[in-house]
């Protein structure tokens, strides 16, 4: 009654296709699988960025797996073969682990990489990224931005840089077709006659960095003797009404009366007959139904009513 053993997968490696963080993990079947021809072998794959507390774990019958990583750090992965209990007339059999690592050999002292990278997807239409040059780099240093997301054949370089003193300090992106709800990868590298420049890698999803335009067409309507309805419209653009949250700031007679967050384009306010002046502004943000995060828009233009009976006039700006 010999103990059943199985070898780990062969040729386990992490392959970088040049997608700025989207890597391929691939392997070959273990040696000596002949005894288990009737069996579907599975593989348990564990991987993580070095420094991460937790491993991601995948069980697959395939010989490859793809995922995104932070290339600022190294990557480690391990894999072993699993023989299901059906193949062994008993309990599941596991091979030893095959392990591999991957990292981009760095160049340049960390301080030379770009500082304060900031990307905003304006109105879910126009992506703009900006950065500051690394510490202590000379004016001959130039930074270049490359990006990739699933759907592009290869990483693309920015073609419309924002410049200051002849240095690239930002990028205006072209129209990015079918680019939201997926990882968007960026690398900013650099060159200098004086010293090597450290590359930086960034990953985000576009829908999470949207800054909408502010709401428009703010109006007042008297609903009753003690209620006023504030209304506004969503700004022009591709963001549907269902994706907005709003924050309203209302001032009554020069004191802040209310700050409120609402999901609709209306807000009903209780007032008194003594109210002499009422002003409000609104700003918008993409809500949790459409993104995991977002950036508040600028405040709308202020809409005010003063000195007239609101029941006699609806104000429209």
């Amino acid at each position: 009654d010999t103990e059943i053993k199985v070898n780990p997968p062969q040729d386990f490696e992490i392959v970088d296709p040049g997608y700025l963080g989207y890597l391929y993990l691939q392997w070959q079947p273990p040696l000596s699988l002949d005894h288990f021809k009737e069996c579907t072998v599975e593989y348990e794959l564990k991987y993580r960025n070095i420094g991460s507390e937790t491993w991601k774990t995948i069980i697959t019958k395939n010989l490859h797996y793809k995922d995104g990583f932070d290339l600022n750090k190294g990557i480690e992965a391990k894999i072993h073969t699993l023989l299901p209990w059906q193949c062994t007339n008993g309990s599941e059999v596991q091979s030893s682990w095959a392990e591999t690592t991957y990292w981009i050999s760095p160049q340049g002292i960390p301080e030379t990489k770009v500082q304060d990278m900031d990307c905003v997807y304006y109105n879910w239409q126009y992506l703009l990224c900006s950065w500051k040059p690394g510490i202590g780099v000379l004016l001959d240093t130039n930074y270049n931005l490359f990006y990739w997301y699933e759907g592009l054949d290869h990483a693309l370089q920015c073609v419309d840089y924002i410049k200051a003193d002849g240095q690239n300090i930002g990028c205006r992106f072209p129209y990015l077709e079918a680019s939201d709800y997926k990882d968007f990868y960026i690398c900013v590298n650099g060159s200098s006659e004086n010293k090597p420049i450290r590359s930086s890698y960034f990953t985000f999803q576009l829908q999470n960095i949207v800054k909408p335009l502010p709401p428009v067409y703010l109006t007042f309507t008297r609903e009753s003797s003690c209620e006023i309805k504030l209304k506004w419209s969503i700004p022009l653009g591709p963001i549907p009404a269902r994706c907005f949250d709003y924050e309203i700031e209302i001032r009554e007679d020069d004191t802040t009366l209310v700050t409120a967050t609402v999901e609709n384009e209306t807000y009903t306010l209780k007032t008194t007959n003594e109210t002499r002046q009422l002003c409000f502004v609104v700003r918008s943000k993409v809500n949790i139904y459409c993104s995991d995060d977002g950036i508040w828009s600028e405040w709308s233009d202020k809409q005010c009513w003063e000195g007239e009976d609101l029941s006699k006039k609806t104000l429209l700006r």
């Epitope: 070095i50 420094g51 750090k73 190294g74 990292w103 050999s105 760095p106 160049q107 340049g108 002292i109 960390p110 301080e111 030379t112 510490i135 202590g136 010293k195 090597p196």
Partner: antibody
Framework: QVQLKESGPGLVAPSQSLSINCTVS????????VHWIRQSPGKGLEWLGV???????DYNSALMSRLTISKDNNKSQVFLKMNSLQSDDSAMYYC??????????WGQGTSVTVSS | QVVLTQSPAIMSASPGERVTMTCTAS???????LHWYHQKPGSSPKLWIY???NLASGVPARFSGSGSGTSYSLTISSMEAEDAATYYC?????????FGSGTKLELK
């Protein structure tokens, strides 16, 4: 296993130049950078520069005009050349492997004395 | 350049005693790039703690590191004879890379 070994002349006359070799084994110079550091009672540990895996070099700006770091990937060797030595350049000179922005393995060092 | 000031310069501790030494940077340094090295007489420095708080391979669990910005420390929870050595902090953030002048830890 990872090893680095420095070899140098030991004694150098003032105003002459110093050449030290660092021979590495257990890793490839195409994957890892190598730093040069020196240590003396007067100045403590002083970073001289680094030859990155990709071939570029960073130097300590205070010594840049006197330093050249080069390498031969095929021979697994990194070279330090320093010109115009003075007595305060007397020190133990180390090479060390760069790994994830730290120096994870050091050679045993080679002692350099500048004296006539 | 970033000057790293270590204190005390020399200290002694009895077996079992808790030991703390500090490293103060003249400019803020990212915790990712602050490391500690350990050196015994006649030997080369060894990486001991990397990225402020991660122990290098083979370093006993009684060692720990902490800090951020300009203030960092290395602690030994219970001194042992083999811990007697000189400890150097090192910043890898800004050029030129620099080291502290060391804390020499002696066995009392």
């Amino acid at each position: 296993q990872v090893q680095l070994k420095e070899s140098g002349p030991g004694l150098v006359a003032p105003s002459q130049s110093l050449s030290i070799n660092c021979t590495v084994s257990g890793f490839s110079l195409t994957k890892y950078g190598v730093h040069w550091i020196r240590q003396s009672p007067g100045k403590g540990l002083e970073w001289l520069g680094v030859k990155w895996a990709g071939g570029s070099t960073d130097y300590n700006s205070a010594l840049m005009s006197r330093l050249t770091i080069s390498k031969d990937n095929n021979k697994s060797q990194v070279f330090l050349k320093m010109n115009s030595l003075q007595s305060d350049d007397s020190a133990m000179y180390y090479c060390a492997r760069d790994h994830r922005d730290a120096m994870d393995y050091w050679g045993q060092g080679t002692s350099v004395t500048v004296s006539s | 350049q970033v000057v790293l000031t270590q204190s005390p310069a020399i200290m002694s501790a009895s077996p079992g005693e808790r030991v703390t030494m500090t490293c103060t940077a003249s400019l803020s340094v990212s915790s990712t790039y602050l490391h500690w090295y350990h050196q015994k007489p006649g030997s080369s420095p060894k990486l001991w703690i990397y990225s402020t708080s991660n122990l290098a391979s083979g370093v006993p669990a009684r060692f720990s590191g902490s800090g951020s910005g300009t203030s960092y420390s290395l602690t030994i929870s219970s001194m042992e004879a083999e811990d007697a050595a000189t400890y150097y902090c090192h910043q890898y953030h800004r050029s030129p890379l620099t080291f502290g002048s060391g804390t020499k830890l002696e066995l009392k």
